[in-house]
């Protein structure tokens, strides 16, 4: 299962940690995708490690763990964020976070 804070808020110009916690007794995580709506932020794979999409490379830092740290937030960053955990065996698990960026 995926456990996450459904709604989080942060100040404009600040940073926020996007975190999904995956728990399973048997399944192993092979890949994690993070998306802002439909746009890829970053992807982790067991083989290749983390890769951050170039459009976000100056604002998105992988970690802690399989989460993301999103920096220099703007009002336009308000919206839905999705984590997708690819696991073996066990399939795909998704989590949703709504981020509200507030004026500082």
């Amino acid at each position: 299962t995926i456990d996450t804070k459904r709604n989080i808020s942060a100040e404009e110009g600040g940073s926020v940690i996007l975190q999904c916690h995956f728990s399973s007794d048997t399944a192993e995580v092979t890949q994690v995708d993070w998306k802002q709506q439909d746009q890829l932020l970053a992807i982790y794979s067991v083989d290749l490690g983390w890769h951050v999409a170039s459009v976000f490379s100056d604002r998105v830092v992988p970690g802690p763990s399989l989460g993301l740290t999103f920096q220099s937030l703007t009002m336009n960053d308000t919206g839905e964020y999705f984590c997708t955990y690819h696991t073996y065996p066990g399939g795909i698990y998704k989590g949703r976070i709504f981020l509200k960026v507030q004026e500082s």
Epitope: L40, V46, D47, L48, G49, H51, A53, P62, G63
Partner: antibody, heavy 119, light 113 residues
Framework: EVQLVESGGGLTQPGKSLKLSCEAS????????MHWVRQSPGKGLEWVAF????????FYADAVRGRFTISRDNAKNLLFLQMNDLKSEDTAMYYC????????????WGQGTLVTVSS | DIVMTQSPSSLAVSPGEKVTMTCKSS????????????LAWYQQKPGQSPKLLIY???IRFTGVPDRFTGSGSGTDYTLTITSVQAEDMGQYFC?????????FGDGTKLEIK
């Protein structure tokens, strides 16, 4: 400022062992995947091994698998390469290098330590 | 393993001239997961360790002058130096990041006339 300083190289004979160290400073060492890359005299670059940050997952080049062991001590900001059963073709400058968080490259390199294997 | 082939192996140019070097990979370096080509370029000056110039085929690393430009996709990549300076002398290596083991090209040696 990111700094990587290798040590432990030297002249040794085939079949012998050496242990290389890399001391890291200026960044949160425990968060980064670290690599060893070597360069034979006058030649190109050859990736040797990496060790992931959190998981400690390791991977080796075929040429060294079973003879070399990569490890790290996050408390002391140290990266190691234990080299056993050395061969003349292992003669090279050995660099430790940091993988940046967001892409599969090497964004910081040490100055290198020279390993010479000769009888 | 992915084989990286660089050409030319060496070239000599005068300061101010434009330089182009190429790197070909034995398979595509496009990573659909992040929609990027996992190709990097490094510069190694004599007696020094390599320095990262370009990643994702075309993105300049921090502090790299804009006379260095990377381009290409799939299996074919190019590093261009517009208006070469004396300090650009050295060896240039490409590196693929799509498969383990990570592999480098044999390098292009740039000499200044």
């Amino acid at each position: 400022e990111v700094q990587l300083v290798e040590s432990g190289g030297g002249l040794t004979q085939p079949g012998k062992s050496l242990k290389l160290s890399c001391e890291a400073s200026g960044f949160t060492f425990s968060s980064f995947t670290m690599h060893w890359v070597r360069q034979s005299p006058g030649k190109g670059l050859e990736w040797v091994a990496f060790i992931r940050s959190g998981s400690g997952i390791v991977f080796y080049a075929d040429a060294v698998r079973g003879r070399f062991t990569i490890s790290r001590d996050n408390a002391k900001n140290l990266l190691f390469l234990q080299m056993n059963d050395l061969k003349s073709e292992d003669t090279a400058m050995y660099y430790c290098a940091r993988r940046p968080l967001g892409h599969n490259t090497f964004d910081s390199w040490g100055q290198g330590t020279l390993v010479t294997v000769s009888s | 393993d992915i084989v990286m082939t660089q050409s030319p192996s060496s070239l000599a140019v005068s300061p101010g001239e434009k330089v182009t070097m190429t790197c070909k990979s034995s398979q595509s370096l496009y990573y659909s997961g992040v929609k990027e080509n996992l190709l990097a370029w490094y510069q190694q000056k004599p007696g020094q360790s390599p320095k990262l110039l370009i990643y994702y085929a075309s993105i300049r690393f921090t502090g790299v002058p804009d006379r260095f430009t990377g381009s290409g996709s799939g299996t074919d990549y190019t590093l261009t130096i517009t208006s070469v300076q004396a300090e650009d002398m050295g060896q240039y290596f490409c590196q693929q990041g799509i498969n383990n083991p990570l592999t480098f090209g044999d390098g292009t040696k740039l000499e200044i006339k």
